[in-house]
């Protein structure tokens, strides 16, 4: 029961985590305009991995995609790659873990095969979570570096001093979503790996050998011989550790210029 619960919970946590990683990757608010000095702005800038946007005080939002591949910073490309790898690994992990779930029976699949699949999906979730955390952290580091570098600079133009204030960006919501989602996927992966240990058939086969002495009728049962076949193919007397007594689970955002009301 505990194994099934651990495996099921691991799957659900990972599912939520991967959904979060996908959401974070698609979100536009990876970095948002720093409003520390000016909490109310007429033009609010924010950027994602795929496009940058402006929300005007008028209520209109306009986004512009990064239509270049070579012109983008290497770090941004790296973050994109890490997030995509995380999503792909997570998706494959989810697919594998569905078939590995103890509550789902597929033909005559061995418990040993389910254990292997659980371990595989667990590792995939762990790597997926790490990719997401790494991607988000790299982007956050890039933001911190740029934040301190972007200072207002002055230059002389027509009619005296003309000021160009470089927009400073700070952490956006997507970073926090990414960190939490990556963490959840990682936790889910660890839970799957723990569940795998419980699923693994550590067999203890007791083979009773009787020695009949002439005058006595004593049966000797030598200490159990441990099956040394790893995940074991001994179908004759197979016993799987199941954490105690259990019953089989029954669970099989432009409005038109003239928008009339």
């Amino acid at each position: 029961m505990a194994v099934t619960a651990c495996q099921g919970l691991g799957f659900v946590v990972s599912l939520i985590g991967i959904a979060g990683i996908i959401a974070a990757t698609c979100m536009d608010q990876w970095s948002t305009q720093d409003l520390y000095n000016n909490p109310v702005t007429a033009v609010f800038n924010y950027q994602g991995l795929w496009r940058s946007c402006v929300r005007e005080s008028s209520g209109f939002t306009e986004c512009r995609g990064y239509f270049t591949l070579l012109g983008l910073p290497a770090m941004l490309q790296a973050v994109r790659a890490l997030m995509i790898v995380g999503i792909v690994l997570g998706a494959i992990g989810l697919l594998v873990s569905i078939f590995a779930l103890k509550c789902i029976r597929i033909g005559s699949m061995e418990d040993s095969a389910k254990a292997n699949m659980t371990l595989t999906s667990g590792i995939m979730f762990i790597v997926s979570g790490l990719c997401a955390i790494a991607g988000v952290s790299v982007f956050a580091n890039m933001l911190v570096t740029n934040f301190w570098m972007s200072t207002a600079n002055m230059y002389t133009g027509m009619g005296g001093m003309v000021q160009t204030v470089q927009t400073r960006y700070t952490f956006g919501a997507a970073l926090f979503v990414g960190w939490v989602a990556g963490g959840l996927t990682l936790i889910g992966g660890v839970m799957m790996c723990i569940a795998c240990r419980g699923l693994a058939p550590e067999e203890t086969n007791y083979k009773a050998v009787s020695y009949h002495a002439s005058g006595h009728s004593v049966a000797y049962k030598p200490g159990g011989f441990k099956a040394s076949t790893g995940f074991g193919s001994n179908t004759k007397n197979k016993k799987i550790y199941d954490g105690g007594a259990r019953t089989e689970d029954e669970v099989q955002s432009y409005p038109s210029k003239h928008d009339y009301v």
């Epitope: 007429a42 005007e56 005080s57 209520g59 927009t167 003239h258 009339y260 009301v261």
Partner: antibody, heavy 118, light 113 residues
Framework: QVQLVQSGAEVKKPGASVKVSCKAS????????VNWVRQAPGQGLEWIGM????????RLNQQFKDKATLTVDKSTSTAYMELSSLRSEDTAVYYC???????????WGQGTLVTVSS | DIVMTQSPDSLAVSLGERATINCLSS????????????LTWYQQKPGQPPKLLIY???TRDSGVPDRFSGSGSGVDFTLTISSVQAEDVAVYYC?????????FGQGTKLEIK
Amino acid sequence: QVQLVQSGAEVKKPGASVKVSCKASGYSFTNYWVNWVRQAPGQGLEWIGMVHPSGSETRLNQQFKDKATLTVDKSTSTAYMELSSLRSEDTAVYYCARVWSGNAFDYWGQGTLVTVSS
Amino acid sequence: DIVMTQSPDSLAVSLGERATINCLSSQSLLASGNQRNYLTWYQQKPGQPPKLLIYWASTRDSGVPDRFSGSGSGVDFTLTISSVQAEDVAVYYCQNGFSFPFTFGQGTKLEIK
């Protein structure tokens, strides 16, 4: 078609208050900010502030924070601007305008002349 | 506050000629998020409210004749009337839509020679 119709001209004594109205029609009133701009005789345009009809959220030019109060009445699709402690330098034409993309003002009211004279 | 400075203060051109009005901002009006300049041009005829001509520095509003065009980026902007007509006699204003408070240029009066 989109229309912003303002209340008529007002003559007030110094120290008095005045409330100018701006009735919107031809569009979804709660979807757009309403701006207020003033123009003193023979002078340029000066932005007073803006109000969002859906939540009565306001953005006010600091120069007018003690002068203007912006409100809306959603039921009648009307925006109001109340000017307090009037002085002779408040004599101007006051316009309401709808905000469009680029924070531009695409439709304007006909203007309300407020004259402050003793 | 962003200061908008227009030049010249007044301009007299012959019918059919080109008119150019400049607007200089004390701060860049370019939004990094969408690479648009938050500069608007208005036309105001005597006794009338201003009329929107151009927003985002170069986007003509619906119904505006194509003889009106806007250009420029960052801090330096230009309104061009390619062939001035009699009905273009008015005062032209530029406006900062980039940051609060929204500010206007002092205006440029266009007259016919």
